[in-house]
């Protein structure tokens, strides 16, 4: 029978003729830094290549014996969930293993960087086709860590890594803060957050989505036709390790923006239960667990995005975040969301020669985070049209007014303290789909692109009681790129897009009272590319 | 940079009382930061990341790498560089005393100093 | 799904011996420890004895010490009890039973975290009597 | 060894009742603990492992607490296929003992 795990990222619209990409990864070379391998078990063996690359420390105390499988138990059981012939994800892909982790499973920073100066090196000497590069290890926050990580993932490799197992914020350890690398939180049979011990998964808005990470069936190094159960992030980030090889093999040209959109893509949506996350995390933790795509063809022609959410401001009264996309990304939108519901929005802005997406604490306001819409737009021309507070009543309003350039969304900013308490609720004219609209005292911004085949449309929720959350999905064949609530409604948190649904979120409504301003209108807007849907034709 | 400091191996013996001084400070005013983890356990002081700036030729990260033991020398510090990089981050890892981070962050071309620290299988 | 079938029971004198076998499908056998479990007619369940996935580590329940023993073959995904001088008081259903469980790494350390017992046979009946 | 007492050792019930089923441990197993239903002439089967947490496919009737020394199996609500016998499990370094198990029955 197939472990569930493998069955859990097998997709559900199963076709044997079209289900795995040519010998499953053969085109892919995946680096593992990890523990010493046991490279002639049945299920690794001829496929993973042992470098010479050794830098460890000492294991730790008097009492530690060095025994051969324990040296090797961790590494081996990773080699085997990537490639393994039996239990393996991508079971035609190629493996180099670099020793960074002792027998105790323990390593340090500056070793690992050495590793990954050593497959740099490797690479600049011998280019290979596709590199993916599994950190199956985690340790406190590092700034040069993260800083190598950015560097070899800006060389066109793909890195991915464990989220760590300490129940935790995955912001506060590296490698998996890192921006560049594809983080993975781990799940069990269940769909539920893995618990490790008194532990457990990472989480928060460092991770990219989870993967199978318990009860893992795998290449166990006490014989070498043994098999074991191991548990971990470490596995979980194994399996998109995998996943990664053999869509990569499949489409050996795609960009690690690309490779990252397609994961989140073709994730299971909205599977995992929130509850074991602590309250304050649940809505920067992504609810995606990873799977193979259902077929090696008819990705191309779809308008990826995702949501990327800012680090938290901090409290001070002109604090602000900022949330940025990967470099290949277009940001499409831009949102806010604070807690305590004080915040003075959130506008685009050039930092760098790129838009960013800023958001901005008020006055007596816990802090804020900046919600970032980021999306895959080939040859994109985007820029931001403000239009400052209005003098009229009508409110502020702004449109795109270039030839052939389309809204992608809506922010709005304010410098007064807590706008709309006292205001009736301003209502956008009908008929008018291609502008943005917000109070007289706020500026406004609209994202105004031009992109082949480009088309958008605005589609609204509005819900005339209180009530906690308005959500508006675009159907499919649509992406969402832009997600705000409708001006007028004082007691609105933010907005924020998770996968195709606009979400606003409003203050407890027993905190409000049902007035006329209870009213929650969600707008979002949804795009579609006919570019990239004919060009994908013209491929097939 | 052209390195000023000479002959290494002969400066622990010929000392000048100018060259006593710190390290030149660094490029453009910017003053290097130090890091470390804010996990206690996981920290191992004693050894440090020198990173340099980005465009740090890899004989200027020599360079440093051999002014820093010369100026701990002359304070009387032993150091030892355990790797010079280059490839994907110029910069150097050195075991030394913590005692001269104040000396290393002076030095020039350096952007920051990070203090060694474990990573743990997942 | 994995299933197990265990074999061998049957009548034996005091002082007799008896092999048990246990055949199970897939990987998912060779990756777990193994239990043998009895109940006596009317009586509890007494756990017996218990075996690694490579066989290395073995363990048993006093009253058996020294007269039972527990092996595996990964080769023919099977698990055995060889019970030596046996008593009127080991008359049981005899199950063999996987012990789920995993291990995982945390701050250097390897743990074991265990499930129970998730999957049994349908056990065979050992009888000893003169 | 570690001893197990389960009590009571006969339960009578009738479905939709709420019921709970003890067992104490000599000595402290932390959170090592595993719950088992059987049937006349069958083989147990697992319903709680690691004090608290269900096992697949088991009713969410079905819930566990405790650690240390004391546990409980709880079911909320009675059903016609809930009357078995029910045993506890300690593991504690890879040897094992059941309790003597608690007998449900219809009241």
């Known amino acids: 029978s197939i472990p569930w795990n493998l069955e859990r990222i097998t997709p559900p619209r199963y076709r044997a003729d079209e289900y795995q990409p040519p010998d499953g990864g053969s085109l892919v070379e995946v680096y593992l830094l990890d523990t010493s391998i046991q490279s002639d078990h049945r299920e690794i063996e001829g496929r993973v290549m042992v470098t010479d690359f050794e830098n460890v420390p000492e294991e730790d105390g008097t009492r530690f014996h060095r025994q051969a499988s324990k040296c090797d138990s961790h590494g081996t059981h990773l080699a085997g969930v990537v490639s393994g012939r039996d239990a393996g994800v991508a079971k035609g892909a190629s493996m180099r293993s670099l020793r960074v982790l002792n027998c105790q499973g323990k390593g340090t920073v500056s070793g690992t960087l050495i590793g990954l100066e050593f497959i740099r090196k490797s690479q600049l000497v011998q280019p290979v086709g596709p590199l993916v590069v599994l950190l199956p290890l985690a340790g406190g926050y590092s700034r040069v860590l993260n800083a190598a990580c950015q560097r070899l993932a800006r060389a066109g490799v793909v890195l991915v890594t464990a989220a760590g197992n300490f129940r935790d914020d995955a912001c506060l350890y590296s490698p998996a803060s890192a921006p560049e690398v594809i983080t993975v939180g781990a799940t069990n049979a269940q769909d539920q957050p893995v618990t490790l011990g008194t532990l457990g998964t990472n989480f928060g808005r460092c991770v990219d989505l989870f993967a199978p990470g318990e009860d893992i069936i795998g290449a166990s190094s006490d014989c070498s036709t043994c098999f074991v159960s191991q548990s971990g992030t470490s596995q979980a980030a194994a399996h998109v390790a995998g996943i990664a090889a053999m869509m990569l093999s499949a489409e050996p040209e795609l960009t690690l923006a690309e490779l990252r959109q397609r994961l989140i893509h073709f994730s299971a949506k909205d599977v995992i239960n929130e509850a074991w996350f602590p309250e304050d995390q649940r809505v920067l933790t992504p609810n995606l667990v990873a799977a193979l795509p259902p077929s090696t063809h008819g990705a191309g022609w779809q308008l990826f995005c995702r949501t990327v959410w800012s680090a938290h401001s901090g409290p001070t009264r002109m604090a602000t975040a900022v949330a940025r996309c990967a470099p290949d990304e277009e940001l499409l939108s831009c949102s806010s969301f604070s807690r305590s519901g004080k915040r003075r929005g959130e506008r685009m802005e050039a930092q760098g020669g790129k838009l960013v997406c800023r958001a901005h604490n008020a006055f007596g306001g816990e802090g804020v985070y900046a919600i970032a819409r980021c999306c895959l737009l080939p040859q994109a021309n985007c820029s931001v049209h403000t239009a400052p507070p209005a003098e009229a009543s009508m409110g502020t309003r702004v449109h795109c007014h270039q030839q052939g350039h389309v809204l992608t969304g809506c922010s709005s900013h304010w410098e007064v303290e807590d706008l709309g308490t006292h205001k009736p609720p301003v209502l956008r004219p009908r008929g008018q789909p291609n502008q943005c609209v917000g109070h007289r005292e706020a500026s406004i911004h609209a994202s105004c692109c031009h992109a082949p085949g480009l088309e958008c449309k605005v589609k609204e929720h509005g819900i005339p009681a209180p009530q906690e959350q308005v959500t508006v999905a675009c159907e499919e064949g649509w992406t969402l790129t832009g997600c705000s609530a409708l001006p007028g409604t004082s007691h609105v948190l933010g907005a924020y897009a998770v996968d195709n649904t606009c979400v606003v979120r409003s203050r407890d409504v027993s905190t409000t009272g049902s007035t006329s301003e209870g009213a929650v209108t969600a707008v979002a807007i949804c795009c579609r590319s006919r570019h990239l849907a004919q060009a994908s034709q013209e491929l097939q | 940079q052209e390195d000023e400091d000479g002959d290494y191996e002969e400066l622990v013996l010929a000392l000048r009382s100018e060259e006593d001084g710190l390290a030149e400070a660094p490029e453009h005013g910017t003053t290097a930061t130090f890091h470390r983890c804010a996990k206690d356990p996981w920290r191992l002081p004693g050894t440090y990341v020198v990173v340099l700036k980005e465009e740090t030729h890899l004989s200027q990260s020599e360079r440093t790498a051999r002014r820093l033991q010369a100026q701990a020398a002359r304070r009387g510090y032993l150091t030892k560089i355990l790797h010079v990089f280059h490839g994907l981050l110029p910069g150097f890892l050195v075991k030394m005393s913590g005692d001269l981070l104040e000396l290393a962050l002076k030095l020039p071309h350096v952007d920051y100093i990070e203090e060694d620290s474990s990573v743990f299988a997942q | 799904e994995v299933q197990l079938v265990e074999s061998g029971g049957g009548l034996v004198q005091p002082g007799g011996s008896l092999r048990l076998s246990c055949a199970a499908s897939?990987?998912?056998?060779?990756?777990?420890?193994m239990s043998w479990v009895r109940q006596a007619p009317g009586k509890g369940l007494e756990w017996v004895a218990n075996?690694?996935?490579?066989?290395?580590?073995?363990y048993y329940v006093d009253s058996v010490k020294g007269r039972f023993t527990i092996s595996r073959d990964i080769a023919k995904n099977s698990l055995y009890l060889q019970m030596n001088s046996l008593r009127a008081e080991d008359t049981a259903v005899y199950y063999c039973?996987?012990?789920?469980?995993?291990?995982?790494?945390?701050?250097?350390?390897?743990?074991?975290?265990?499930?129970?017992?998730?999957?049994w046979g349908q056990g065979t009946t050992v009888t000893v009597s003169s | 060894d570690i001893q197990m007492t389960q009590s009571p050792s006969t339960l009578s019930a009738s479905v939709g009742d709420r019921v709970t089923i003890t067992c104490r441990a000599s000595?402290?197993?932390?959170?090592?603990l595993a719950w088992y239903q059987q049937k006349p002439g069958k083989a147990p089967k697992l319903l709680i492992y690691?004090?608290?947490s269900l096992e697949s496919g088991v009713p969410s009737r079905f819930s566990g607490s405790g650690s240390g020394t004391e546990f409980t199996l709880t079911i909320s609500s009675l059903q016609p296929d809930d009357f078995a016998t029910y045993y506890c499990q300690q593991y504690n370094s890879y040897s094992y003992t059941f309790g003597q198990g608690t007998k449900l029955e219809i009241k």
């Open positions: 897939g990987i998912t056998f060779s990756s777990y420890w």
């Open positions: 000595q402290s197993i932390s959170s090592w």
């Open positions: 039973a996987r012990d789920r469980g995993t291990y995982y790494y945390q701050e250097g350390s390897y743990n074991y975290y265990y499930y129970g017992m998730d999957v």
């Open positions: 075996i690694k996935q490579d066989g290395s580590e073995k």
């Open positions: 690691k004090a608290s």
